[in-house]
């Protein structure tokens, strides 16, 4: 699998999309996991609804949400209030019994907020009563890693 890079701005939301063949993965739940090291396991962050028919319902784990368009074949992950520690390598997965097929490898890059030198009074934050659904989601910038690029820097 090639790795696709998604870039987001710190403090904003990042949407990651993972297209897949809807017929090939029919009836299967999906998951978003974080790769622990270059050859380490992929630690589950969030998975779609236990009932495949309800996969379109957004499920949250902390600041990460997942939703699946099972007919169109697009898994969408939203990382809310992106932070520098969210940067890293992830996978979109299709689950089948004890197996997990990789749909896409994703490298999340977090860019510094160009506004973070301003007073907090100039920034808008969703209030407690406001639904996050109505908040503006920044379009993510994505690209595939070039051959030879490595998602994990070599460790000394």
């Amino acid at each position: 699998h090639n790795t696709t890079v998604f870039q987001g701005v710190a403090g904003q939301s990042l949407q990651v999309s993972c297209p897949y063949d809807s017929m090939k993965h029919w009836g299967r739940r999906k998951a978003w996991c974080r790769q622990l090291g270059e050859k380490g396991p992929c630690q589950r962050v969030v998975s779609t609804h236990n009932l495949w028919l309800l996969s379109f319902l957004r499920r949250w784990n902390g600041s990460t949400a997942i939703t699946d368009d099972t007919l169109g074949g697009t898994l969408t992950i939203t990382l809310r209030n992106l932070q520098p520690h969210d940067a890293g390598l992830y996978q979109c997965q299709s689950l089948h019994g004890s197996e997990a097929d990789t749909l896409r490898k994703v490298l999340v890059e977090v860019l510094a907020d160009p506004l973070d030198h301003r007073d907090a009074g100039d920034l808008w934050f969703p209030g407690e009563s406001e639904s996050f659904e109505d908040a503006h989601v920044e379009h993510s910038i994505s690209r595939s890693l070039l051959e030879g690029e490595i998602p994990f820097p070599p460790t000394s």
Epitope: D21, M23, K24, G27, L51, W52, H96, S98, E99
Partner: antibody, heavy 122, light 108 residues
Framework: EVQLVQSGAEVKKPGESLKISCKGS????????IGWVRQMPGKGLEWMGI????????RYSPSFQGQVTISADKSISTAYLQWSSLKASDTAMYYC???????????????WGQGTMVTVSS | DIQMTQSPSTLSASVGDRVTITCRAS??????LAWYQQKPGKAPKLLIY???SLESGVPSRFSGSGSGTEFTLTISSLQPDDFATYYC??????????FGGGTKVEIK
């Protein structure tokens, strides 16, 4: 009509190679997994492996890994099961089956080929 | 690998009898289980999928139940056409997919 039609019976000698086929019709061949099943004379059903013709993703049962090769040619809606060197113990009926889908998200092997009898004898 | 243990291996019954066949999985397979009927010289025929859903065109005397590790196929009133061999199939995972050993239903 949705159907899978398999190639005819084969009689081979040990050590010979063989490729049997399973042609799908009446549905989008590239969009459904195709599995292969072995049934030795007087015995039960054994799973061999499965292929998704859309991208040729293939999974094998550990018992058959390295013993057979499963492939597909989507341009002619045909899946294949092949041996490079047959043994007498490969004598069996071989079935292909389509993994059908249901609106509930369920799947099942709903359509089966008529079977191909392979006899390996010196 | 998951093992599927089917019982009994042979069952003698009469027309009109209620027949129950059991399949046990060595670990949970949720409801990814199907039941097939096979007659001599013929390909298997799908009866039940998703543990309890009746395949289109299959008589309603056939029913399936169970989830997790224990599943049953029930024929409420055995008919002459039902004497055959029945197999359960676990397709919870593709490597491998596993059949039960089969149950031959014969005339008493």
């Amino acid at each position: 009509e949705v159907q899978l039609v398999q190639s005819g019976a084969e009689v081979k000698k040990p050590g010979e190679s063989l490729k049997i086929s399973c042609k799908g019709s009446g549905y989008s061949f590239t969009s459904y997994w195709i599995g292969w099943v072995r049934q030795m004379p007087g015995k039960g059903l054994e799973w061999m492996g499965i292929i998704y013709p859309g991208d040729s993703d293939t999974r094998y049962s550990p018992s058959f890994q390295g013993q057979v090769t499963i492939s597909a040619d989507k341009s002619i809606s045909t899946a294949y099961l092949q041996w490079s060197s047959l043994k007498a113990s490969d004598t069996a009926m071989y079935y292909c089956a389509r993994l059908g889908i249901y609106s509930t998200g369920a799947t099942a092997f709903d359509i089966w080929g008529q079977g191909t009898m392979v006899t390996v004898s010196s | 690998d998951i093992q599927m243990t089917q019982s009994p291996s042979t069952l003698s019954a009469s027309v009109g009898d209620r027949v129950t066949i059991t399949c046990r999985a060595s670990q949970s397979i949720s409801s990814w289980l199907a039941w097939y009927q096979q007659k001599p010289g013929k390909a298997p025929k799908l009866l039940i999928y998703d543990a309890s859903s009746l395949e289109s065109g299959v008589p309603s005397r056939f029913s399936g139940s169970g989830s997790g590790t224990e599943f049953t196929l029930t024929i409420s009133s055995l008919q002459p056409d039902d004497f055959a061999t029945y197999y359960c199939l676990d397709y919870n995972s593709y490597s491998p997919i596993t059949f039960g050993g089969g149950t031959k239903v014969e005339i008493k």
